[in-house]
């Protein structure tokens, strides 16, 4: 069985301010078990944007039904985009671990650029 890969097919996405950004991400396998998380930026200072496991992320919706047992689409939509949302977004697969889940594979990232509203 081939090892799971995280695919972010879009290197960049351009969205007008006030619109909704769609950030695409798929996994190539259901195993190992563990959640998907989305981050803006990389490294220790990265910002958590969405956690499949828990948390309240009012601006974020998932494109697919993540309660499907065979779901491998972890794409998200972020509403009401502002220039402050610009950055590179990473879709990261974790595998279960104790006491904490362990980062397993990351997508290559999608750069979100925000076009200002015409005045």
């Amino acid at each position: 069985e081939e090892e799971l890969q995280v695919i972010q097919p879009d290197k960049s996405v351009l969205v007008a301010a006030g619109e909704t950004a769609t950030l695409r991400c798929t996994a190539t396998s259901l195993i190992p078990v563990g959640p998907i998380q989305w981050f803006r930026g990389a490294g220790p200072g990265r910002e958590l944007i969405y956690n499949q496991k828990e948390g309240h992320f009012p601006r974020v919706t998932t494109v697919s039904d993540l309660t499907k047992r065979n779901n491998m689409d972890f794409s998200i939509r972020i509403g009401n985009i502002t220039p402050a949302d610009a950055g590179t977004y990473y879709c990261v697969k974790f595998r279960k671990g104790s006491p904490d889940d362990v980062e397993f594979k990351s997508g290559a990232g999608t750069e979100l650029s925000v076009r200002a509203k015409p005045s």
Epitope: I31, V33, D65, T67
Partner: antibody, heavy 117, light 108 residues
Framework: EVQLVESGGGVVQPGGSLRLSCAAS????????MSWVRQAPGKGLEWVAG???????YYGDSVKGRFTISRDNSKNTLYLQMNSLTAEDTAVYYC???????????WGQGTLVTVSS | SYELTQPPSVSVSPGQTARITCSGG??????YAWYQQKPGQAPVLVIY???KRPSGIPERFSGSSSGTTVTLTISGVQAEDEADYYC???????????FGGGTKLTVL
């Protein structure tokens, strides 16, 4: 407070049918996967069927082709249609809310189904 | 028949430590939970995701995993802990939820 209340159990003859309901409250029903789990008298737990928030369905081998799980998100209600019942289906049937990774964090009190002639 | 294996019974004295094991699922494709069931009552989740404790469950309940075996540990067992304990899993490779046969915990 999360509440799950099952109904629809009773006595049915072999070969008969029954529909169970589970009324959910205290959480966003439409966002959660749900399952039915049963327990024969004096026996252990057996997973029966599960359904995603978008109504994709999954079944245990012992009920495949005979039972149908469904949901009505507008009514916050989970259903289990049981056909071609046999004595082996006699059990308390629980509805359970699923966690993000398909374990069961809340259970109803159960409804007893007895298949007997 | 049960896909997960756990001992049928465990006996301990009050204040002692009870350990109940469960095995049978591949680590990479399984999540485990433990459910407590008292006579005439519905099951209650006491451990989920192998080793996480839900809010409201006493700290004396803990879970651990090693390879294909998970263990429920009850430290300082109390009389009220006497119950049946079921190991339950989610198997991502088959989309099913197997259970163990249950372990009757007796507090002597």
């Amino acid at each position: 407070e999360v509440q799950l209340v099952e109904s629809g159990g009773g006595v049915v003859q072999p070969g008969g049918s029954l529909r169970l309901s589970c009324a959910a409250s205290g959480f966003t029903f439409s966002s959660n996967a749900m399952s039915w789990v049963r327990q024969a008298p004096g026996k252990g737990l057996e997973w029966v069927a599960g359904i995603s928030s978008g109504s994709d369905t999954y079944y245990g081998d012992s009920v495949k082709g005979r039972f149908t799980i469904s949901r009505d998100n507008s009514k916050n209600t989970l259903y289990l249609q049981m056909n071609s019942l046999t004595a082996e289906d006699t059990a308390v049937y629980y509805c359970a809310r699923e966690t993000w990774n398909h374990l069961f964090d809340y259970w109803g009190q159960g409804t007893l189904v007895t298949v007997s002639s | 028949s049960y896909e997960l294996t756990q001992p049928p019974s465990v006996s301990v004295s009050p204040g002692q430590t009870a350990r109940i094991t469960c095995s049978g699922g591949a680590y990479s494709s399984y999540y485990y939970a433990w459910y407590q069931q008292k006579p005439g009552q519905a099951p209650v989740l006491v451990i989920y995701s192998d080793d996480k404790r839900p809010s409201g469950i006493p700290e004396r309940f803990s879970g651990s995993s090693s390879g294909t075996t998970v263990t429920l540990t009850i430290s300082g067992v109390q009389a009220e802990d006497e119950a049946d304990y079921y190991c339950g899993g989610y198997d991502q490779s088959s989309y099913t939820n197997p259970f163990g046969g249950g372990t009757k915990l007796t507090v002597l």
